[in-house]
Interface confidence: low
């Protein structure tokens, strides 16, 4: 009679994470008598996966009934596969011995590869806000996928970005992999509503890529433009001066009025109006009693936006003559930078 052979017909098996792997093994003879064991890996460090004779292996079931006398099918199923299960599995026939069974013959081995989905991409932006025209970096990370082949794309508002660098780790063989990508994005004043999207495509995702997003509203700072204008007089000796703070983001803003360098009033932006592009406008006004000043008055609107160094705009108020009525120009209509003396 021909000597027993252990046949593992599958060189490799590819299974999705969470599914069941079937590892096939057939013996060509019933002789010699003895149990079958399954191992992952070869050599002294191999890991016992299943022992026909004894032990408890909750994730492993046999394909056929190994208690039947004439059974020669030693295939097993391993449930709830994870990337950690990847490796080469050997079906090994033992010959009954005393006191211990002796290894008789091994199958050629079946390589189990696990297809694992990448984790949802996490996109993170810079720690500090940046202003328009500056280039900022965004990172995207996804982990735990297998096989290694993966595609990552960056988009800004649906437009694909080209300035990015991607690494997949580790470089060598591994049970699972991670991807890390850094994209450079140039900010514009219109980016408050913009989104940066990292898209990951992998064989396990069946054509539905995973996406991670970052809102540029978390990243951008649009500094305000200031305009100080003088409004028509309210009374014989009172002048109303407005400071228009336009197109700023985020909302955090503090405004201080200075009269000849002395603090007159400080206030925080509250009832702002929002522009279509997501930036804000705000207006503050100061009622100046001209009769209280003997000399010309320098009015300064000083704005501290989002913790940045203050910016200011000044307006000279001459008190040497009575103020004239201005035209019908309202603050909203006066779009130029009006620093003219109107006396």
């Amino acid at each position: 009679e021909e000597e027993l052979q252990v046949i593992q017909p599958d060189k490799s098996v590819l299974v999705a994470a969470g599914e069941t792997a079937t590892l096939r093994c057939t013996a060509t003879s019933l002789i010699p008598v003895g149990p079958i064991q399954w191992f992952r890996g070869a050599g002294p460090g191999r890991e016992l996966i299943y022992n026909q004779k004894e032990g408890h292996f909750p994730r492993v079931t046999t394909v056929s009934d190994l208690t039947k006398r004439n059974n020669m099918d030693f295939s097993i199923r391993i449930g709830n596969i994870t990337p950690a299960d990847a490796g080469t599995y050997y079906c090994v026939k033992f010959r009954k011995g005393s006191p211990d069974d002796v290894e008789f013959k091994s199958g050629a081995g079946t390589e189990l590869s696990v297809r694992a989905k990448p984790s949802a991409p996490v996109v993170s932006g810079p720690a500090a806000r940046a202003t328009p025209q500056h280039t900022v970096s965004f990172t995207c990370e996804s982990h735990g996928f297998s096989p290694r082949d993966i595609t990552l794309k960056w988009f800004k508002n649906g437009n694909e970005l080209s300035d990015f660098q991607t690494n997949v780790d580790p470089v060598g063989e591994s049970v699972s992999y991670s991807i890390h990508s850094t994209a450079k994005v140039v900010l514009t004043r219109e980016d408050v509503h913009s989104q940066v999207i990292c898209e990951v495509a992998h064989v396990t995702l069946q054509g539905d890529p995973l996406r991670g997003t970052a809102n540029l509203s978390e990243t951008i700072r649009v500094p305000p433009t200031l305009e100080v204008t003088q409004q028509p007089v309210r009374a014989e000796n009172q002048v109303n001066v407005t400071c228009q703070v336009r197109k700023f983001y985020p909302q955090r803003l503090q405004l201080t009025w200075l009269e000849n360098g002395n603090v007159s009033r400080t206030e925080t932006a509250s009832t702002v109006t929002e522009n279509k592009d997501g930036t804000y406008n705000w207006m503050s006004w100061l009622l100046v009693n001209v009769s209280a000043h003997r000399d010309d008055v320098k009015l300064t609107c000083q704005v501290e936006h989002d913790g940045q160094p203050a910016v200011s705009k000044s307006h000279d108020l001459k008190v040497s003559a009575h103020p004239k009525e201005q035209g019908s120009n309202t603050a909203a209509e006066n779009t130029g930078s009006n620093e003219r003396n109107i006396y």
């Epitope: 490799s12 098996v13 590869s113 096989p147 082949d149």
Partner: antibody, heavy 119, light 103 residues
């Protein structure tokens, strides 16, 4: 770069056999389904056969079922098509194609090999 | 079977749409063949995915059982036969091909 190179084409008589090969490089061959597509002279593309990544499942067009056998050797990064009982209407250029996720989509194609069946 | 028009024409720089319908595919692909016997080139796979070497003027969309290949800014080199592909009860199928003529 992904490359698929077919070979094994030639002129045979009706009823004879031929074995086509496709050598793959530039990607992890064992992770992808592979397909044979053919194009008869003056005709459109016709799907012939597909094999799963592990090689344990094969699909065939009705026109070749029982005559053609698709196989692969992942250790050699190679795909094969054993064609038996060849007929005149099997005359075509045979392309090897790499499938992408679902086996009915192909993202890379070989240049093809011509099979002529003529008496 | 997948049904697509036998031929379409487009002006240089214009936009052209080629539709494909039928079969019971959930997803489709589009393939370009510039001359009979030359290797097909994948333009779109799985409805909307474009290989990295394919220009962005080619795009795909699918609604129900109809898939559409759109070429915006048609170039002279786009003159070719375009095949749609899908699956039907386990079999791979192709449309008969649409010849694009650039005017």
């Amino acid at each position: 770069d992904v490359q698929l190179v077919e070979s094994g084409g030639g002129v045979v008589r009706p009823g004879e056999s031929l074995r086509l090969s496709c050598e793959a490089s530039g990607f992890t061959f064992r992770n992808y389904y592979m397909t044979w597509v053919r194009q008869a002279p003056g005709e459109g593309l016709e799907w012939v056969s597909t094999i799963s990544d592990t090689g344990d499942t094969a699909y065939y067009a009705d026109s070749v079922k029982g005559r053609f056998t698709i196989s692969r050797d992942n250790s050699k990064n190679s795909l094969y098509l054993q064609m038996n009982s060849l007929r005149a209407d099997d005359t075509a250029i045979y392309y090897c194609a790499k499938s992408w996720i679902w086996w009915t989509f192909f993202d890379y194609w070989g240049l093809g090999t011509l099979v002529t069946v003529s008496s | 079977a997948l049904t697509q028009p036998a031929s379409v024409s487009a002006n240089l720089g214009g936009t052209v749409e080629i539709t494909c319908s039928g079969g019971n595919s959930n997803h489709y692909g589009w393939y370009q063949q510039k001359s009979p016997g030359s290797a097909p080139v994948t333009l779109i796979y799985a409805d909307t995915n474009r290989p990295s070497n394919i220009p962005s003027r080619f795009s795909g969309s699918t609604s129900g059982s109809t898939t559409t290949l759109t070429i915006t800014g048609v170039q002279a080199e786009d003159e070719a036969v375009y095949y749609c592909g899908g699956s039907s009860t386990g079999d791979g199928i192709f449309g008969a091909g649409t010849t694009l003529t650039v005017l």
